[in-house]
Amino acid sequence: SETTTGTSSNSSQSTSNSGLAPNPTNATTKAAG
């Protein structure tokens, strides 16, 4: 999938964590189609 940034604000601002995507892990791999 694709995400375009540079428009509205980020929903993660209320947390203490960064809103950037975490490091990839094999658990995030998409299921085979």
């Epitope: 995400t3 540079g6 604000s9 980020n10 601002q13 950037l20 995507a21 490091n23 892990t25 094999n26």
Partner: antibody, heavy 118, light 107 residues
Framework: QVQLVQSGAEVKKPGASVKVSCKAS????????MGWVRQAPGQGLEWMGE????????TFNQKFKSRVTMTRDTSISTAYMELSRLRSDDTAVYYC???????????WGQGTTVTVSS | DIQLTQSPSFLSASVGDRVTITCRAS??????LAWYQQKPGKAPKLLIY???TLHSGIPSRFRGSGSGTEFTLTISSLQPEDFATYYC?????????FGQGTKLEIK
């Protein structure tokens, strides 16, 4: 040690496309996003976007969304960035950079100079 | 987009001096600010991330501080190899953005 080695300098005509490669070594290529940053002559740094090497999910800077294509080949630990419909103001050094969630852009390629000139 | 404004844009100093560069964000980025050093013809090098954490191999004369919207990079005793351009960069939200840079020159 972590190394990112980019392809060589390119000279292109306006309207053409350029594809820059970035070969990673010294770490698990699939464990980190690969970002792309450019720097026009005498100017600052501009983030273009990044790719998740496992899922191929991409996040773009809106400025480049319509012209940039990011891909990867995990079998050779290489990321690619293609910029189309080149203009003279795309003349810049293009860097790949590994992004770690905790530390941000922690390792960078040596840069690829792209010159757009008629 | 989050705008980062560095000051000063140019700084002249001498070996042994203590210098401070400021980076202000247009809205809170919590602690998620990184600092980079770039020398002519070379790629940027990460110095500090998450506001104050020194990247591996970076000398302890480099110190980062701040949170929210105001951050500083301090070099406690300038060495000849420290004369370069320094950039701040927020890693709190997309799109990732950079400050315009501070060029540190020999006086």
């Amino acid at each position: 040690q972590v190394q990112l080695v980019q392809s060589g300098a390119e000279v292109k005509k306006p309207g053409a496309s350029v594809k820059v490669s970035c070969k990673a070594s010294g770490y698990d290529f699939t464990g980190y996003h690969m970002g792309w940053v450019r720097q026009a002559p005498g100017q600052g740094l501009e983030w273009m976007g990044e790719i998740n090497p496992i899922t191929s999910d991409k996040t773009f800077n809106q400025k480049f969304k319509s012209r940039v294509t990011m891909t990867r080949d995990t079998s050779i630990s290489t990321a690619y960035m293609e910029l189309s419909r080149l203009r003279s103001d795309d003349t810049a050094v293009y860097y790949c950079a590994r992004r770690d969630y905790g530390t941000s852009l922690d390792y960078w390629g040596q840069g690829t100079t792209v010159t757009v000139s008629s | 987009d989050i705008q980062l404004t560095q000051s000063p844009s140019f700084l002249s100093a001498s070996v042994g001096d203590r210098v401070t560069i400021t980076c202000r964000a247009s809205k809170s980025i919590k602690k998620y600010l990184a600092w980079y050093q770039q020398k002519p013809g070379k790629a940027p090098k990460l110095l500090i991330y998450a506001g104050s954490t020194l990247h591996s191999g970076i000398p302890s004369r480099f110190r980062g501080s701040g949170s929210g919207t105001e951050f500083t990079l301090t070099i406690s005793s300038l060495q000849p190899e420290d004369f370069a351009t320094y950039y701040c960069q927020q890693h709190n939200e997309y799109p990732i953005t950079f400050g315009q840079g501070t060029k540190l020159e020999i006086k």
